[in-house]
Interface confidence: low
């Protein structure tokens, strides 16, 4: 049976939630539970994936849609369509081969995800160090030296940054 | 049980018109395809096409292009052949099968005898 | 449009009988499919997806082929088996079915 669409292709007209069965005889037949066709014309419906283990289900699986997943809770998504779930960590760590690390000095993570990034240089731009940055926060920069009034201090740079921390692997 | 139900047997005049019911039972008639098969006396079968029950696109076999129609009213489960201008050579007993690419149940056959 | 050539065209076999019949395609097709009918009935769907029995058929029937070989057999032949087998396929685009001509088989 050739497979090239026709108008007269008994699968053209079948609606996506149903398929076009193999036995020749039948039109459009629905999914069958646990599976889904997203698009109309299609021979077979797909399996519908299963959020198991570290996976959650966000979204039922339906005849017309599959199911979409998260992560249970000390786990985040990560690749597209949340493939995969990885640890989380505390703010100010990141995820190494060897698990979560602290972030070293001159670095910092806002996130339970991700790799610690370098404080910014204030004296980049020209300006200096408002709030210090801690392993959770990255420094807060003020306005350059020249516009302090008389008197006022500034607080001291930090130390030049590192490169960023290893990503996960 | 599946069953499809033929309209009863026919007799015509050359050049005139007949229409050939097929009602079906026991399935969800939109679900399968409708085909239509000929017999000449003491012949073989012969395809003349089917009609796709779910969207009413009908397909003819080479044969069967003009004169023939199939047509459909879904609502009654129903699925109709139509022969205009008849001629001697229609003769023979129609079937109408479900499915279409392996027609798995058939009518008891609608004999038609075309004679002036 | 593919032509289904079906031999003997008639054949008696006595009860026990091995019978075999073919079925050759004038070009490759997918599977073929097999019907019986007896004389004033309807045919009925007796083998298809080339191996497959349709429900209700003895077991001592049987299809295998391929290509454009396609073959019934019957491995005990029964009075009950008299009557005449056509082949089917259903191929193309617009896909279209053809039938042979049917085999007759009889009952010495």
């Known amino acids: 049976f050739e497979r090239t669409r026709s108008l007269q292709d008994p699968c053209s007209n079948c609606p996506a939630g149903t398929f076009c069965d193999n036995n020749r005889n039948q039109i459009c037949s629905p999914c069958p539970p646990n599976s889904f066709s997203s698009a109309g014309g299609q021979r077979t419906c797909d399996i519908c994936r299963q959020c198991k283990g570290v996976f959650r289900t966000r979204k039922e699986c339906s005849s017309t849609s599959n199911a979409e997943c998260d992560c249970t809770p000390g786990f985040h998504c990560l690749g597209a369509g949340c493939s995969m779930c990885e640890q989380d960590c505390k703010q100010g760590q990141e995820l190494t081969k060897k698990g979560c690390k602290d972030c070293c000095f001159g670095t910092f993570n806002d996130q339970k995800r991700g790799i610690c990034r370098p404080w910014t240089n204030c004296s980049l731009d020209g300006k200096s160090v408002l709030v210090n940055g801690t392993k959770e926060r990255d420094v807060v920069c003020g306005p350059s030296p020249a516009d302090l009034s008389p008197g006022a201090s500034s607080v001291t740079p930090p130390a030049p940054a590192r490169e960023p921390g290893h990503s996960p692997q | 049980q599946i069953q499809l139900v033929q309209s009863g047997p026919e007799l015509k005049k050359p050049g005139e018109t007949v229409k050939i019911s097929c009602k079906a039972s026991g399935y969800t008639f939109t679900t399968y395809g409708m085909s239509w098969v000929k017999q000449a006396p003491g012949k073989g079968l012969k395809w003349m096409g089917w009609?796709?029950?779910?969207?009413?696109?009908?397909t003819y076999a080479d044969d069967f292009k003009g004169r023939f129609a199939f047509s459909l009213e879904t609502s009654a489960s129903t699925a109709y052949l139509q022969i205009n201008n008849l001629k001697n050579e229609d003769m023979a007993i129609y079937f109408c099968?479900?499915?279409?690419?392996?027609?798995?149940?058939w009518g008891q056959g609608t004999t038609l005898t075309v004679s002036s | 449009q593919i032509v289904l050539t079906q031999s003997p065209a008639i054949m008696s076999a006595s009860p026990g009988e091995k019978v075999t019949m073919t079925c050759s395609a004038s070009?490759?097709?997918?599977?073929m499919n097999w019907y019986q009918q007896k004389s004033g009935t309807s045919p009925k769907r007796w083998i298809f997806?080339?191996?497959k029995l349709a429900s209700g058929v003895p077991a001592r029937f049987s299809g295998s082929g391929s290509g454009t070989s396609y073959s019934l057999t019957i491995s005990s032949m029964e009075a009950e088996d008299a009557a005449t087998y056509y082949c089917q396929q259903w191929s193309g685009n617009p896909p279209i079915s053809t039938f042979g001509s049917g085999t007759k088989l009889e009952i010495k």
């Open positions: 997806d080339t191996s």
């Open positions: 070009s490759s097709v997918s599977y």
């Open positions: 099968a479900r499915g279409y690419g392996s027609p798995d149940y």
């Open positions: 009609i796709n029950t779910y969207s009413g696109v009908p």
